[in-house]
């Protein structure tokens, strides 16, 4: 048995006479032989679930579910109740109604075995019938909504009449009907005004019925019509077995360059027309088991279950359903020497499914793990300026397919043939397994005899000791010009183009900083700034060379504070800035300001933008929104 609603509403007035019927509660059956028996909780409750008093006023007919006043609620009783409501005005009280024998003790009131009946209290006597508006004669203030379980026997779930009105205003005639399309499974009995289902409902065919209740009031010569929504929601049960969309029960996959733990190798999708079990229970009740294979397979793979709600069309309306993605995932990094083929089976069990048929499916994954060979081009040829500053990036080396690698560790080394001309260093980029070549020793660059630098590039996978080698020829070009004395170590310090281009800074391949002119569009990723090389800085990413020294590219790498209009980078740097951004790396501070100081208001907002009151904000910066900035520009 279950209630067709979780809450009911009615009005209570002072001195309403004993015997006044209040409302019906309705229970629906889960099985044909069930007979409901209703029981009221012992107490009345007020604001914030405050237990006010033992319920001495309202009774229920156990077999019909009719609630009625056993004795009149007089003013003194009401004042006694109000005094216990934690000082709040007593506007609403509620009772708990239980379905016996579902719950024998009064505890938490949870649907389906308990419903709450709320009474809005009016500290006046029942109004004169002639003063009641049609809306008040027809429907409760709170619109009801109904919940009906699918596949259950049909039954009565609502009674339209407002019983106190009918009892106290017998001369007013009120008629009801349901507006519904042809063939809908609901019926409103003209005599009893009871609404019932004609047959068992199927949620997979229709989940929501948006009906309309029509009430016609006859008072003397006048007739008025009131219409309200009458929504019914069909509740799901696990009556659908899982299936394969389009019958696809097998997925094939090749593991080659992506060998990292947590890589998704293949995915198979299972469809279930149900939306139960609910999300909290789903993973426990909808199980997937990688069937025993060899130890290597069990250690290497795992299956991840990713359920998702979807909607499907049924009989012209959309109903919810569930798609379950089963992902075959690498449980560990795979060595580049690994080479094997296997078939894996996964058993999926919808353990709540009651039949007919089985709630079990078998998923098949065919997986080939291919070995990876390390290959480098036979040779590389690069040039570098004699004026290049330390940490200037001059090129990349990359084993074949390195951009596609994940979970494959490749370390690059440079072996110089001329000991005194060892100018370059190499670091492995974590992003694409390439090696970034950078200037490590500027003194060697300046030696006249170091006009050509010869290196051997060695790429090694330490796990397998596999290696690849290539020649690297670096031509040193141009004349050395001593850098300006007193220039900042970081290009990022400069905030105007002339001062930027007259100095060099760490990471500069040409020995001169480069100015990046922004697009001037509010808080933008393309802000103006001074950089050692606009190819690499700023690009929204603190690369492995830039991490070597904060002075190279604080715009990408700063972990400190940014003052002015900006959006911080994740996890560091400036993702977007307003106007020109310059930085003081040794202070972990950057500033983003308008480029042309023409608009005094904007100047005030951005240039002098600091902390509001440091104590108030705990030192957090107050950021200006892009909208603010646009607004100031337009005006």
């Amino acid at each position: 048995l279950y209630f067709s609603r979780d809450a009911y509403w009615e009005k209570l007035y002072v001195d309403q006479p004993a015997g006044t019927p209040l409302l019906y509660v309705h229970a629906l059956r889960d099985a044909p032989e069930e007979v409901p028996s209703f029981r009221l909780g012992q107490h009345l409750y007020g604001t914030y679930r405050t237990r006010l008093h033992e319920n001495n006023w309202i009774c229920i007919q156990e077999d019909t579910g009719l609630l009625y006043l056993n004795r009149s609620l007089d003013r003194s009783s009401w004042e006694k109740l109000s005094g216990r409501n934690r000082g709040f005005p007593l506007l609403t009280v509620y009772l708990k109604v239980f379905l016996s024998p579902t719950s024998l003790r009064e505890g938490e009131c949870q649907w389906p075995g308990c419903a709450r009946v709320y009474f809005s209290f009016f500290n006046t006597s029942f109004p004169a019938c002639t003063s009641l508006k049609p809306r008040e004669l027809c429907f409760p203030e709170t619109r009801p909504s109904f919940r009906i379980r699918e596949n259950r026997p049909p039954g009565t779930f609502h009674q339209f009449r407002l019983l106190p009105v009918q009892f106290l205003c017998p001369n007013i005639s009120v008629a009801y009907r349901l507006l519904e399309g042809e063939g809908l499974p609901f019926r409103c009995a003209p005599d009893s005004l009871e609404v019932s289902t004609r047959w068992a409902l199927d949620r997979e065919q229709r989940e929501k019925y948006e009906l309309v209740a029509v009430c016609t009031v006859h008072a003397g010569a006048r007739e008025e019509v009131v219409m309200v929504p009458f929504p019914v929601t069909v509740y799901d049960e696990d009556d659908s077995a899982p299936t394969f969309p389009a019958g696809v029960d097998t997925a094939s996959a090749v593991v080659e360059f992506k060998r990292k733990e947590d890589t998704v190798v293949a995915t198979l999708r299972v469809f279930d027309a149900d939306v139960v079990p609910a999300s909290g229970e789903l993973v426990r009740r909808y199980t997937s088991t990688l069937l025993p294979g060899d130890t290597w397979t069990q250690q290497t793979f795992r299956v991840e279950h990713w359920p998702n709600e979807t909607s499907v069309q049924a009989n012209g309306s959309f109903v919810r359903a569930t798609v379950h993605d089963y992902r075959l995932v690498l449980n560990r990094n795979l060595s580049i020497s690994e080479n094997r083929t296997m078939q894996l089976a996964v058993l999926v069990n919808d353990s709540d499914f009651q039949g007919p048929g089985a709630g079990v499916l078998l998923l098949h994954f065919n997986v080939s793990v291919l070995p990876v060979s390390l290959h480098l081009p036979s040779s590389y040829s690069l040039s570098v300026s004699r004026r290049a500053r330390r940490f200037a990036q001059i090129g990349k080396v990359c084993v074949e397919n390195c951009q596609a690698f994940s979970g494959i560790n490749v370390q690059y080394e440079l072996h110089s043939s001329g000991a005194n001309c060892s100018t370059l260093g190499v670091v492995t980029s974590a992003e694409d397994t390439s090696g970034i070549l950078f200037v490590n020793d500027t003194k060697a660059l300046r030696r006249p005899k170091c006009a050509e630098l010869h290196y051997m590039v060695v790429a090694t996978n330490h796990q397998t000791s596999r290696q690849a080698q290539a020649q690297l020829l670096v031509t040193v070009e141009g004349l050395y010009v001593a850098e300006e004395a007193g220039c900042p170590l970081s290009c990022a310090v400069s905030k105007r183009r002339p001062e930027c281009e007259e100095c060099g800074g760490l990471g500069s391949p040409t020995g001169r900083c480069e100015w990046r002119q922004g697009d001037g569009k509010g808080i933008t990723r393309n802000f103006s700034t001074c950089s050692p090389s606009t190819k690499t800085c700023p690009d929204g990413h603190c690369d492995v060379v830039e991490t070597q020294d904060i002075n190279i590219c604080p715009q990408d790498c700063l972990r400190g504070s940014i003052v002015g209009g900006h959006e911080p980078g994740e996890p560091r740097g400036i993702k977007a800035g307003y106007g020109t951004c310059n930085c003081f790396p040794e202070e972990e501070k950057c500033f983003c300001e308008p480029e042309d100081i023409q608009d005094p208001l904007c100047d005030e907002l951005c240039r002098e933008q600091k902390l509001i009151s440091e104590e108030d904000l705990g030192g957090e910066q107050k950021l200006i929104s892009e909208e603010d900035l646009h607004h100031h520009h337009h005006h």
């Epitope: 300006e484 004395a485 007193g486 220039c487 900042p488 170590l489 310090v493 400069s494 905030k495 105007r496 001062e499 007259e502 904060i550 972990r559 400190g560 504070s561 003052v563 002015g564 310059n582 003081f584 790396p585 040794e586 202070e587 972990e588 501070k589 500033f591 300001e593 240039r607 902390l611 440091e614 104590e615 705990g618 030192g619």
Partner: antibody, heavy 121, light 107 residues
Framework: EVQLVESGGGLVQPGGSLRLSCSVS????????MRWVRQAPGKGLEWVSG????????YYADSVRGRVTISRDNSKNTLDLQMTNLRAEDTAVYYC??????????????WGQGTLVTVSS | DIQMTQSPSSLSASVGDRVTITCRAS??????LNWYLQRPGKAPKLLVY???SLQSGVPSRFSGRGSGTDFTLTISSLQPEDFATYYC?????????FGQGTKLEIK
């Protein structure tokens, strides 16, 4: 009210060591870079050392590099300058200063009263 | 390193006078320049930052100008408490050097 109070100065022999401290209050210490600036008797101001708000970045004047270490404890609101291998030319009043920033670099908006270090045999 | 040179080294003036002190950088420092005042036996006090921005609480008779290599600090009408030593300091490139100071004395 912002306050910076230096301590730890005194007379020390050449080659000796000294630890200067600066206790601060009245602002959120961890949000600000700090500096040590010194002034030899009757002379001008000389920037000695700096440290970023987090303490992660430190830097020194060439005249003291390798002989001094700047550090800070943000939980105790203190700034320290450890000086070793002291020379006669290190004799000066040492000031700690709070660094504020504009986009045109640092400026020192609050200073301590100074502590005198005398290096003499 | 950037050298900062102030002129004059010392200057005599009277209360109410208008006084200008000059600071020259050995290379362009754009507007990365600050001015401080120091009274005898006291710590320096910030007057002007970023060449021309007046620090809050500093009287408006003080003003700074300049860009590149040449900068000036002007006191429009000297007050008795203004007789002190003035220092410029560049914040463009480490080490962040100070000028040698200008001593302003009562005539």
């Amino acid at each position: 009210e912002v306050q910076l109070v230096e301590s730890g100065g005194g007379l020390v022999q050449p080659g000796g060591s000294l630890r200067l401290s600066c206790s601060v209050s009245g602002f959120i210490f961890k949000n600000y870079a700090m500096r040590w600036v010194r002034q030899a008797p009757g002379k001008g101001l000389e920037w000695v050392s700096g440290i970023s708000g987090s303490g992660g970045i430190t830097y020194y004047a060439d005249s003291v590099r390798g002989r001094v270490t700047i550090s800070r404890d943000n939980s105790k609101n203190t700034l320290d300058l450890q000086m070793t291998n002291l020379r006669a030319e290190d004799t000066a009043v040492y000031y700690c200063a709070k660094a504020e920033y504009s986009s045109s670099g640092a400026y020192f908006d609050y200073w301590g009263q100074g502590t005198l270090v005398t290096v003499s045999s | 390193d950037i050298q900062m040179t102030q002129s004059p080294s010392s200057l005599s003036a009277s209360v109410g006078d208008r006084v200008t002190i000059t600071c020259r950088a050995s290379q362009s420092i754009h507007n990365y320049l600050n001015w401080y005042l120091q009274r005898p036996g006291k710590a320096p006090k910030l007057l002007v930052y970023a060449a021309s921005s007046l620090q809050s609480g500093v009287p408006s008779r003080f003003s700074g100008r300049g860009s590149g290599t040449d900068f000036t600090l002007t006191i429009s009408s000297l007050q008795p408490e203004d007789f002190a030593t003035y220092y410029c300091q560049q914040s463009y490139s480490a080490p962040y050097s100070f000028g040698q100071g200008t001593k302003l004395e009562i005539k």
